[in-house]
Amino acid sequence: EEELQVIQPDKSISVAAGESATLHCTVTSLIPVGPIQWFRGAGPGRELIYNQKEGHFPRVTTVSDLTKRNNMDFSIRISNITPADAGTYYCVKFRKGSPDHVEFKSGAGTELSVRAKPS
């Protein structure tokens, strides 16, 4: 079977401050089992934006129903965008592990730029 790919189709998007940003991400396989997480930035300094399994992420909603068994769409919508939200967002697939999940594969990233709110 072909190895799972994480696809972020948008290289960049631009959103006005105060609006919502939709960040698209799909995977090509249900295997390996494990959650998706979204990060802003890469490397050790990256910010956790959304974790499928734990935490409370009030500005983030998922575009699809992640509880559906065969779901492969892990796109998210971030509401009320501010200048501090600008950056590159990565959709990252983790392999289920104990006690911690292990990072398996990352998407190529989507750069979010924030425009000034139209007056």
């Epitope: 300094g45 974790n51 409370h56 992420f57 009030p58 501010t82 200048p83």
Partner: antibody, heavy 119, light 108 residues
Framework: DVQLVESGGGVVRPGESLRLSCAAS????????MNWVRQAPGEGLEWVSR????????DYADSVKGRFTISRDNSKNTLYLQMNSLRAEDTAVYYC????????????WGLGALVTVSS | ETVLTQSPATLSVSPGERATLSCRAS??????LAWHQQKPGQAPRLLIY???NRATGIPDRFSGSGSGTDFTLTISSPQTEDSAVYYC??????????FGGGTKVEIK
Amino acid sequence: DVQLVESGGGVVRPGESLRLSCAASGFSFRSYAMNWVRQAPGEGLEWVSRINSGGGGTDYADSVKGRFTISRDNSKNTLYLQMNSLRAEDTAVYYCAKQYDWNSFFDYWGLGALVTVSS
Amino acid sequence: ETVLTQSPATLSVSPGERATLSCRASQTVGSKLAWHQQKPGQAPRLLIYDASNRATGIPDRFSGSGSGTDFTLTISSPQTEDSAVYYCQQYYYWPPYRFGGGTKVEIK
């Protein structure tokens, strides 16, 4: 219930070091950015430092940059502030504060730890 | 850096008399403004976030309004237990996170 409990405060001489701890409970600690905020006697609130959920991203106020180091141990649900080369003007109550989400306000505060720097 | 200016520095009101506190930002912060209450000898407590949303457990006599650069915290009918210092906090531009200088509310 969310609880944040600081410890490690005390009286030190100028130039000495101190490490503050903040024990967190009642929420998924590893999913949230955390901050230190201080309050000098009779003064207002001053943000000191922030660390992202994974621990790899840190920010500091100019007044403490190069002297203070923020860190966290997600396996112990504990936040730290290592304070070196302490000055009289660092005398304050130090609060740890949880962020509502990564780019947001502080929704819970600890009770505070008093640090006194005096010769 | 965004500077937050609170006024008045001190506000003295009688119980039941409306209290209005102001916070002005040096540049727009959208609706990204919170209010915190700090009673003497206690830690701060979140009251209002996103300019107008009450935090969990906050009585409805507290309300927030405004957007852009001008914000208001209103205590519609202050109680003696509302004696405290009130701080605004912006989280539109950071770091650094900025707080206003505070308004001390005294209930006569």
